[in-house]
């Protein structure tokens, strides 16, 4: 009679995480008598997965009844598969011996590969806010997927971005993989309502990609524009001056009025109006008693926005002229920079 062969008919078994893997193995003969054992890996460090003779293997069940005398099917099922179960499994026939059974013949092995879904992509933006025209970086990370093949795309408001770099780690074989991508985005003044989306497609997702989002409202700072104007006179000796603070984001803003360089009043933006693009407008006014001044008055509206250096705009109020004839000179004096906007 021909010598016993151990046949593992599958080179590979591909299973989704959480499912059951069937590892097939048959013997071509009942002789020699002795048990079958399953191992993961080969050599001295191999891990025992199932022993027909003894032991407790709660995740393993046999496909057929191994107690039947003429059984030659030694296939097993392993339940609740995780990526950690990936590896090469060997079905090994032992010959009955004394005191110990002796390894007789091994199958060629079956490689178990586990399909695991990527985690939901997490998108994170820069630590500090940035102003329009600046380029900021966003990162996207997803972990725990297998196999390694994965596709990552970036979008801003539905438009695909092209300026990004992606790495999948590790480079070599592993039970599971991670992806890390960095995208560069140029901010515009209209980006308060914008979203950056990272989209991950993987074979386990059956054509339904995972998405992670970041709102540019958490990244952008739109500095305000200031306009100081003189309103018609309320009374013979009073002038109403307004400071229009336009198109700013976020809302955090403090305004200080100065008369000839001296602080007159400080207030925090509260009842703001929101523009369609998500930026805010606010107006502050100052009632100036002209009769209290002998000389011309320099009125300055100074705004500190979102912790940035103050920006200001001034208005010269000429006391010598009749208030009703006063023009609206809006010569500006910058005590801070409109361009430098950092925390």
């Amino acid at each position: 009679e021909e010598e016993l062969q151990v046949i593992q008919p599958d080179k590979s078994v591909l299973v989704a995480a959480g499912e059951t893997a069937t590892l097939r193995c048959t013997a071509t003969s009942l002789i020699p008598v002795g048990p079958i054992q399953w191992f993961r890996g080969a050599g001295p460090g191999r891990e025992l997965i199932y022993n027909q003779k003894e032991g407790h293997f709660p995740r393993v069940t046999t496909v057929s009844d191994l107690t039947k005398r003429n059984n030659m099917d030694f296939s097993i099922r392993i339940g609740n598969i995780t990526p950690a179960d990936a590896g090469t499994y060997y079905c090994v026939k032992f010959r009955k011996g004394s005191p110990d059974d002796v390894e007789f013949k091994s199958g060629a092995g079956t490689e178990l590969s586990v399909r695991a879904k990527p985690s939901a992509p997490v998108v994170s933006g820069p630590a500090a806010r940035a102003t329009p025209q600046h380029t900021v970086s966003f990162t996207c990370e997803s972990h725990g997927f297998s196999p390694r093949d994965i596709t990552l795309k970036w979008f801003k408001n539905g438009n695909e971005l092209s300026d990004f770099q992606t790495n999948v780690d590790p480079v070599g074989e592993s039970v599971s993989y991670s992806i890390h991508s960095t995208a560069k985005v140029v901010l515009t003044r209209e980006d308060v309502h914008s979203q950056v989306i990272c989209e991950v497609a993987h074979v386990t997702l059956q054509g339904d990609p995972l998405r992670g989002t970041a709102n540019l409202s958490e990244t952008i700072r739109v500095p305000p524009t200031l306009e100081v104007t003189q309103q018609p006179v309320r009374a013979e000796n009073q002038v109403n001056v307004t400071c229009q603070v336009r198109k700013f984001y976020p809302q955090r803003l403090q305004l200080t009025w100065l008369e000839n360089g001296n602080v007159s009043r400080t207030e925090t933006a509260s009842t703001v109006t929101e523009n369609k693009d998500g930026t805010y407008n606010w107006m502050s006014w100052l009632l100036v008693n002209v009769s209290a001044h002998r000389d011309d008055v320099k009125l300055t509206c100074q705004v500190e926005h979102d912790g940035q250096p103050a920006v200001s705009k001034s208005h010269d109020l000429k006391v010598s002229a009749h208030p009703k004839e006063q023009g609206s000179n809006t010569a500006a004096e910058n005590t801070g920079s409109n361009e430098r906007n950092i925390y």
Epitope: Q8, P9, K11, T88, G109, E111, P147, D149, V203
Partner: antibody, heavy 118, light 108 residues
């Protein structure tokens, strides 16, 4: 569209070596076992070697065992066959073939010709 | 090693006729048998797998039958493009995978 394109064939002397490549596209390469099948001039098909999804399990025909090595690089979607100690009887068209779930071949490349001649 | 024997070696038929090709295995291969078609200068093409399942895009004039050790490929109403060499292959029994020697279907 599934495509398998073999390269690396040529004329060599007995005892010399060669490396064949198969560039795969149009499918998830790392989801399929792969094989090499050869066909000598005027002869039938002969399976040469097969490899598992991640390369952990390799099978060889007795006629090439110890002389040929099959491997794959999933990051490059490429299958390889290294041919050592070549003999005149290894002269054949070598086809790269994609295996379906139960080791039959559902897609084939056009082949690359290996000629071993002194 | 499982040996597959194909017969006849050559089959001479006219277009419109039915071709019956045989493949016999030296051991029980259950239903693990595939059929391929190869035309001169071309790579083989999968026709039938699991003894009787038609591969994608294969016309229904090709049919497979059998299990265990005896298998048949039938081509009804032969078309001009069907004249080629046909191979059977067994699988599902570990290495080595083996092919039959082939049957040439030629125009009479």
């Amino acid at each position: 569209d599934v495509q398998l394109v073999e390269s690396g064939g040529g004329v060599v002397r007995p005892g010399e070596s060669l490396r064949l490549s198969c560039a795969a596209s149009g499918f998830a390469f790392s989801d399929h076992d792969m094989s090499w099948v050869r066909q000598g001039p005027g002869e039938g098909l002969e399976w040469v070697a097969g490899i598992s999804l991640r390369g952990g399990v390799t099978w060889y025909a007795d006629s090439v065992k110890g002389r040929f090595t099959i491997s794959r690089d999933n990051s490059k979607n490429t299958l390889y066959l290294r041919l050592f100690s070549l003999r005149t009887e290894d002269t054949a068209i070598y086809y790269c073939a994609r295996e379906s779930w139960n080791t039959f071949f559902d897609y084939w490349g056009l082949g690359t010709l290996v000629t071993v001649s002194s | 090693e499982i040996v597959l024997t194909q017969s006849p070696g050559t089959l001479s038929l006219s277009p419109g006729e039915t071709a019956t090709l045989s493949c016999r295995a030296s051991q029980n291969v259950r239903s693990n048998l595939a059929w391929y078609q190869q035309k001169p200068g071309q790579a083989p093409r999968l026709l039938i797998y699991d003894a009787s399942s038609r591969a994608t895009g294969i016309p229904d004039r090709f049919s497979g039958s059998g299990s265990g050790t005896d298998f048949t490929l039938t081509i009804s109403s032969l078309q001009s493009e069907d004249f080629a060499v046909y191979y059977c292959q067994q699988y599902g029994n570990g290495p080595p995978l083996t092919f039959g020697g082939g049957t040439k279907v030629e125009i009479k």
